[in-house]
């Protein structure tokens, strides 16, 4: 059929509760694509019925709530104009109890789900929750070890938890809960994750180095096509996270009618000592406005910009 | 290093009641549960309760309501258990072990007699 | 209430022996469960968090592992101090709750 195959790594998660996952392989979704889900090379593609348990929801495909029997690998088609993509996503269930976040003994465990507080230092956990636009997240709640986290060393902050004056004692199993709401109905989502405390600064101290861009501008004409990548090397063991903003925003959230410009989904190579981490910015189409604006790359605490200008004319 | 001193022992009167004390050092004392188990004389651990320090909330054991109170004392870094009109039932040594990660750390315990 | 049912309750065995001591849960507890030491002085000590996670300072001839809602504490190569009392706790729901005991005693 003509179609290439990519296949991405393992997805490991919890029955019972609501699952998504975005079909987007930048830069082949940047542009005007079609994408259609279908479970084990089935024929037949998954519903796009918002009332089905799973169904296509966009790019995404949304299980309301994910089962033991969902199991198996789940294909995306992305067709351009000119060519073809099926990315493979193996998607495996595990059975867990409401509050057992001692998931470590799990092969493969993404990152999500083991993540590293720094003794001393004033740092955060993540609450990993990805779900269309469709899907309405209310406020999050952690615990640990089954019972509510509190305490002034303790805030959340949208999906994060901040502890400050991290101490020897915060290693353990946490869980992050929020409510979806989606259709009028609601789930509970909880994500269990693994904590260890490091003393290691790690590699080039723990604030992140931005790689590229460098603060400079970039020369690009008028109407066409631009991806850029923000490089970042960061510890292993870091919990920060990489975006794109424009005006202080980001710039999935400030472009998120017209969605002109998109930013990519991160991909990273391990090294001994480090991560590189990509991730980048797609403009589909250049415009007048976008030019002298500061597109931004955040990682952590570092940032780095573009700058977008119209090249010099040729007088030649 | 965490530790949590109790006590070794405390001589009570029937009918009369007993604050038996936990004091903690070495952790941040407001930011994890602080739970209390008692043992019976050749028996098991039984779970009475627990207190987060930073707000008291507190959970008891259905088995001990009525007769145990979960108190803190932040400033202190103690944890309190008050035991109301003990019997020979109440004969048994009490621990405090802080949840820090759950039941880390234990006080020695403190043996409580009831005695006329 | 979670009933934990702990076997044996007492057991006799070598220096140097394997040994396991198994907990069952009544209900689901996920890898709620901790393994305790209770030493003839009373003195408490956990040696297993989490169902399987060793803590600091234990020994590696300790272990613990889960089948289904069966819970076990293996000692690989029992030393003299491992002659004690060990219990098992769910932390899972309250009221937490703890298995009756096993003694280990020295054959």
């Known amino acids: 059929d003509g179609c290439k195959d990519i296949f991405m790594k393992n997805e490991i998660l919890s029955a019972s509760q609501p699952f998504a996952f975005n079909c987007t392989f930048p830069p082949i979704t940047s542009g005007e694509v079609s994408v259609t889900w279908y479970k084990n090379s089935s024929k037949i593609p998954v519903s796009k019925i918002i009332q089905s348990r799973i169904h296509q929801d966009e790019t995404w495909i949304l299980f309301l709530p994910m089962e033991w029997g969902d199991s198996g690998v789940y294909q995306c088609v992305i067709k351009g104009r000119d060519s073809c993509h099926r990315i493979h996503v193996n998607l495996t269930v595990f059975e867990k109890h409401w509050c057992d976040t001692s998931i470590g003994g799990l092969p493969n465990l993404s990152d999500e789900y083991k993540q590293i507080l720094h003794l001393g230092k004033d740092d955060s956990l993540t609450c990993h929750l990805h779900f269309p636009k469709s899907c309405v997240l209310g406020p999050i709640k952690w615990y640990k070890d089954c019972n509510e986290i509190k305490g002034e060393r303790f805030t959340v902050l949208e999906t994060r938890l901040l502890v400050s004056n991290v101490s020897a004692e915060d290693r353990g199993n946490y869980a992050c809960q929020a409510i979806l709401t989606h259709s009028g109905k609601q789930y509970e989502v909880l994500n269990g994750i693994t904590v260890s405390i490091t003393e290691r600064a790690g590699y080039g101290g723990s604030v992140p180095k931005i790689i590229y861009p460098k603060n400079h501008s970039i020369e690009v004409q008028l109407g066409t096509t631009l991806i850029v990548d923000c490089n970042v090397t960061d510890t292993k063991d870091n919990t920060n996270l990489r975006c794109w903003r424009v005006n202080n925003t980001l710039v999935d959230d400030y472009y998120d009618e017209s969605k002109r410009i998109r930013e990519g989904v991160e991909t990273h190579v391990s090294f001994r000592e480090h991560n590189l981490y990509t991730v980048n910015i797609t403009f589909l189409e250049v415009k007048m406005e976008d030019y002298g604006l500061p597109f931004m790359c955040h990682a952590g605490v570092s940032t780095a910009y573009i700058i977008l200008q119209l090249p010099a004319p040729d007088f030649r | 290093e965490v530790q949590l001193q109790q006590l070794g022992a405390e001589l009570v009167r029937p009918g009369a009641s007993v604050m038996l004390s936990c004091k903690v050092s070495g952790y941040f004392f407001t930011s994890y549960w602080m739970n209390w188990v008692n043992q019976r004389p050749g028996q098991g651990l039984e779970w009475i309760g627990m207190?987060?320090?930073?707000?008291?909330?507190?959970r008891l054991n259905q088995k001990f309501k009525g007769k145990a109170t979960l108190t803190v004392d932040k400033s202190a870094s103690t944890a309190y258990l008050q035991l109301s009109s003990p019997t020979s039932e109440e004969y048994a040594v009490y621990y405090c072990?802080?949840?820090?990660?759950?039941?880390?750390?234990w006080g020695q315990g403190t043996l409580v007699t009831v005695s006329a | 209430d979670i009933l934990m049912t702990q076997s044996p309750s007492s057991l006799s065995a070598s220096l140097g022996e394997r040994v396991s001591l198994t907990c069952r849960a009544s209900q689901d507890i996920g890898n709620a469960l901790n393994w305790l030491q209770q030493a003839p002085d009373g003195t408490i000590k956990r040696l297993i968090y989490?169902?399987?996670s060793l803590d600091p300072g234990v020994p590696k001839r300790f272990s613990g592992s889960r089948s289904g809602s069966d819970y076990s504490l293996t000692i690989s190569s029992l030393a003299s101090e491992d002659f004690v009392y060990y219990y098992c706790l769910q932390y899972a729901s309250s009221p937490y709750t703890f298995g009756g005991g096993t003694k280990l005693e020295i054959k």
């Open positions: 989490a169902t399987s």
């Open positions: 207190i987060h320090p930073y707000d008291s909330e507190t």
């Open positions: 072990a802080s949840s820090t990660t759950a039941f880390a750390y």
